[in-house]
């Protein structure tokens, strides 16, 4: 028989999405046991029928990768989990409506920081996503978000920071003191979607000035 409250077997059914990798996660409820099994279905918003996710039927782990199934950027999706206990009790819970564009969070960018004598160069590498274009190429975040820009900061001392930003991939902070350590932070920002990545940090030291030796 079904439990009085589905939360006894199943809680917190939600998508966790980062750089468009969309993972469905959930927790077992207080009545859940290690041998409780979970089956996952998903559907596109507006469709009537649920589709069973292959590889996520009668599983005991509490996550299921739905990246491929929810890969259309213009669609909205739902997923649901059905938990069945060893005693035959079952409960089903559905996610909120999911939009990868809206809900995905951004990981820190991949950056190369290069020391020079009086400057520090930062080269941002485009971030790939699991989403494939029609030609088979993987889309980068730059392909998806028109307004994506990079915000770079260089901590010069306790009270002074230098800032650069833009849609370019190469930046250079000039006018620095040779043989000095600096802390750089680089973030991805997408203002129209109110997204900001955690920062990539690099601690770099300008090269010594050999011209005087």
């Amino acid at each position: 028989h079904a439990p009085e409250d589905p939360s006894d077997l199943l809680q917190h059914v939600k998508f966790q999405s980062s750089n468009f990798e969309n993972i469905l996660t959930w927790d077992s409820g207080p009545e859940g046991t290690p041998d409780t099994v979970y089956s996952i279905e998903y559907k596109t918003y507006g469709e009537r029928d649920w589709v069973a996710k292959k590889g996520c039927q009668r599983i005991t782990r509490k996550s299921c990768n739905l990246t491929v199934e929810t890969g259309n950027l213009t669609e909205l999706y739902y997923a649901r989990v059905t938990a069945v206990s060893a005693g035959g009790r079952s409960a089903t819970k559905m996610t909120d409506r999911f939009s990868s564009l809206q809900h995905t969070t951004l990981k820190p960018p991949d950056v190369t920081c290069i020391s020079k004598v009086r400057s520090i160069q930062m080269i941002v590498h485009p971030t790939p996503t699991p989403i494939r274009a029609g030609d088979g190429h993987r889309l980068t975040l730059e392909d998806i978000f028109h307004d994506l820009f990079y915000h770079l900061e260089l901590q010069v001392n306790r009270t002074y920071q230098m800032h650069l930003g833009g849609k370019q991939r190469e930046y250079e902070f000039f006018g620095l003191t040779p043989d000095t350590e600096f802390l750089g932070t680089i973030m991805i920002c997408v203002p129209t979607w109110a997204k900001e990545s955690a920062p990539y940090m690099c601690r770099v030291k300008t090269l010594p000035d050999r011209t005087w030796t």
Epitope: D143, H146, F149, L164, G166, K167, E170
Partner: antibody
């Protein structure tokens, strides 16, 4: 050398349609953001639409939504702007432009669109 | 949409004059501002990007600066070839929006 060459402009009656083309060369067209920008006679510049040639993601300015459609033919390195239900206020020179290495730095020479009865 | 208020709409300058054009954004756009030069019958040409970074090949008499949501283009000594219309462009968020333009004429 980057080159953008627009064509397809002309005189059209209000309510009519026109399809602009922009032939691109000298850069990787299949992974770029491409724009249509217009300039009404004696007026300023206005971004009309943008498309990412790889993802197909598009954006439009509010005044043309539902009337204009931006698209590409990546095999032919060509950008299009299908303009329907044209109004007199759409009269302008239409430029295509591209963003290369983060900069909107390359523009075509423009094609004139006149909407008049 | 982000509004860009550009001033003055026109100005007269003598050759060698220092000229400044300003743009005010209706909200924060960080440093996502470009300056373009346009001559009659031509497409716009990028001069400054990122509020203050000079495009390669652009003469050093052009410079850009920013303070909060206010941006300035300065021509330190106007030459005859600089007589044109100048536009600021915010690239922070779609729709990208230009200022109304500043026509620089000879006095």
């Amino acid at each position: 050398e980057v080159q953008l060459v627009e064509s397809g402009g002309g005189l059209v009656q209000p309510g009519g349609s026109l399809r602009l083309s922009c032939a691109a060369s000298g850069f990787t067209f299949s992974s770029s953001w491409m724009y249509w920008v217009r300039q009404a006679p004696g007026k300023g510049l206005e971004f009309v639409s943008v498309i990412n040639t790889r993802s197909g993601i598009t954006h439009y300015v509010e005044s043309v939504k539902g009337r204009f459609t931006i698209s590409t033919d990546n095999a032919k390195n060509t950008l299009f702007l299908q303009m329907n239900s044209l109004k007199s206020e759409d009269t302008a020179v239409y430029y295509c432009a591209t963003r290369i290495q983060g900069l909107i730095d390359y523009w075509g020479q423009g094609t004139q669109v006149t909407v008049s009865s | 949409d982000i509004q860009m208020t550009q001033s003055p709409s026109s100005l007269s300058a003598s050759l060698g004059d220092r000229v400044t054009v300003t743009c005010q954004a209706s909200q924060s756009i960080r440093s996502s501002l470009n300056w373009y030069q346009q001559k009659p019958g031509q497409a716009p040409k990028l001069l400054i990007y990122g509020a203050s970074r000079l495009r390669i090949g652009v003469p050093s008499r052009f410079s850009g600066s920013a303070s909060g949501t206010s941006f300035t283009l300065t021509i330190s000594g106007v030459e005859a070839e600089d007589l044109a219309t100048y536009y600021c462009l915010q690239e922070y968020a779609w729709p990208l929006t230009f200022g109304q333009g500043t026509k620089v004429e000879l006095k």
